[in-house]
C-alpha cells in the first residue's frame, strides 16, 4: 500500500534541546491508520489516527535528537482481510538539522 507523506512542521527546532514535530499522513484510502515513526531504523513513537483523520503529528521531546542518528521515516498499518495488518511502504526520509552556532 502507498507510502505516507512526511513533513517537519513548525515550530522548527533550533537546537538539540528543542522539541521536534513531524507530521505523517496516509493517502486518502486509509483514515484511522496506525502510524510508526522511525529514526535510523529504530522505532521512536507509535500513534493511531482518529477514525476521521488521515494523519498524525509526532511530538518528540527535547533531546530526542541525541537518540540514534539518521533521518526520520514513517509508516502506517491498516487491517486488511482476515484482520491481518498490512504495512505501507516507508515514507521519504526527513532530516532534522540545526542552525550552525555563530560564535
Amino acid at each position: 500500500i502507498p507510502a505516507p507523506s512526511i513533513r517537519l512542521v513548525p515550530p522548527y527546532p533550533s537546537s538539540q534541546e528543542d522539541p521536534i514535530h513531524i507530521a505523517c499522513m496516509a493517502p486518502g484510502n486509509f483514515p484511522g491508520a496506525n502510524f510508526t515513526l522511525y529514526r535510523g531504523g529504530q522505532v521512536v513513537q507509535l500513534l493511531q489516527a482518529p477514525t476521521d483523520q488521515r494523519g498524525v503529528t509526532f511530538n518528540l521531546s527535547g533531546g530526542s535528537s541525541k537518540a540514534p542518528g539518521g533521518p526520520f521515516h514513517c509508516q502506517y498499518g491498516v487491517l486488511g482481510e482476515l484482520n491481518q495488518s498490512q504495512l505501507s511502504d516507508l515514507s521519504e526520509p526527513v532530516n532534522v538539522s540545526f542552525p550552525v552556532p555563530t560564535w
Epitope: 500500500i1 502507498p2 507523506s5 513533513r7 512542521v9 507530521a23 499522513m25 493517502p27 486518502g28 484510502n29 486509509f30 483514515p31 482518529p50 476521521d52 483523520q53 488521515r54 494523519g55 503529528t57 491498516v78
Partner: antibody, heavy 116, light 107 residues
C-alpha cells in the same frame, strides 16, 4: 497516464435521481480512494463525500447524508455517485476525484441540470 | 466542522508580480492543506499538498507555506497562464472542506 472519465451530461426533473459513473485507468484502482466534488454555476467547490476502494468505507458531507450514495466496482475500475430527491439547487458540475495525498486526478466533470 | 477562509477573495495583478493568497483554518489542521488552480470551463488542478509540497509537473514559481491555522500560496512571478481561481482545501479531518476561492485577474 492516469485518467478519470465520467459519464455524460444529464437533465432531470425535481424529485428524480441521478447516477454518475467515473471510470479510472492508468493506476491501481484499489490503492486510492475517491471523493466527489460539485460546483454550482458561478460558485465554489463543494465536497460531497468519500469512499475507500480498500474496504468500501464511506463518509458524507452532512448536508448530503441520506440523499447520496457512493459505490465502487473494482471489476470495472469504476466509481459511482447517486444523488436522490433532486432539487433545482442540485444543478451543478459533478466531479469524481482520485483522493490520494490530495485530490490529484480529476474527472472532466458531469453537468447535471435539474429543471421542471 | 472546520471552516477555511481565503483572502483576498479577488486579486488584480500584473504579469511579473509576486502574489500571495492566504488561507486561514478555524482550528489547527497540522500541515494537511492543499492548493488548487481552476480555469474557466476546466476541472481544478492540484498545485500543492501537505502545505508546501509541489505536485509533480507544477512550475517552481508556485510555493506554499504554513502550518496549524495559517497558510499561504505564493506565485513568485505571475505568468499569463496563472490568471485563474485558486482554492485551498483541508485534508486533516472529514468533511474535506474547501475555501471559498480567490479569483486572480489581470490588472
Amino acid at each position: 497516464q492516469m485518467q478519470l472519465v465520467q459519464s455524460g451530461a444529464e437533465v432531470k426533473k425535481p424529485g428524480a435521481s441521478v447516477k454518475v459513473s467515473c471510470k479510472a485507468s492508468g493506476y491501481t484502482f484499489t490503492t486510492h480512494a475517491f471523493s466527489w466534488v460539485r460546483q454550482a454555476p458561478g460558485l465554489g467547490l463543494e465536497w460531497m463525500g468519500w469512499i475507500s476502494t480498500y474496504n468500501g468505507n464511506t463518509k458524507y458531507e452532512q448536508k448530503f447524508q441520506g440523499r447520496v450514495t457512493l459505490t465502487t466496482d473494482s471489476s470495472t475500475n469504476t466509481a459511482y455517485m447517486e444523488l436522490r430527491s433532486l432539487r433545482s439547487d442540485d444543478t451543478a458540475v459533478y466531479y469524481c476525484v482520485r483522493d490520494s495525498r490530495a485530490f490529484d486526478v480529476w474527472g472532466q466533470g458531469t453537468m447535471v441540470t435539474v429543471s421542471s | 466542522d472546520i471552516q477555511l477562509t481565503q483572502s483576498p477573495s479577488f486579486l488584480s495583478a500584473s504579469v511579473g508580480d509576486r502574489v500571495t493568497i492566504t488561507c486561514r483554518a478555524s482550528q489547527g489542521i497540522n500541515s494537511y492543506l492543499a492548493w488548487y488552480q481552476q480555469k474557466p470551463g476546466a476541472a481544478p488542478k492540484l498545485l500543492i499538498y501537505a502545505a508546501s509540497t509541489l505536485q509533480s509537473g507544477v512550475p517552481s514559481r508556485f510555493s506554499g507555506s504554513g502550518s496549524g491555522t495559517e497558510f499561504t500560496l505564493t506565485i513568485s512571478s505571475l505568468q499569463p497562464e496563472d490568471f485563474a481561481t485558486y482554492y485551498c482545501q483541508q485534508l486533516n479531518t472529514y468533511p474535506l472542506i474547501f475555501g471559498q476561492g480567490t479569483r486572480l485577474e489581470i490588472k
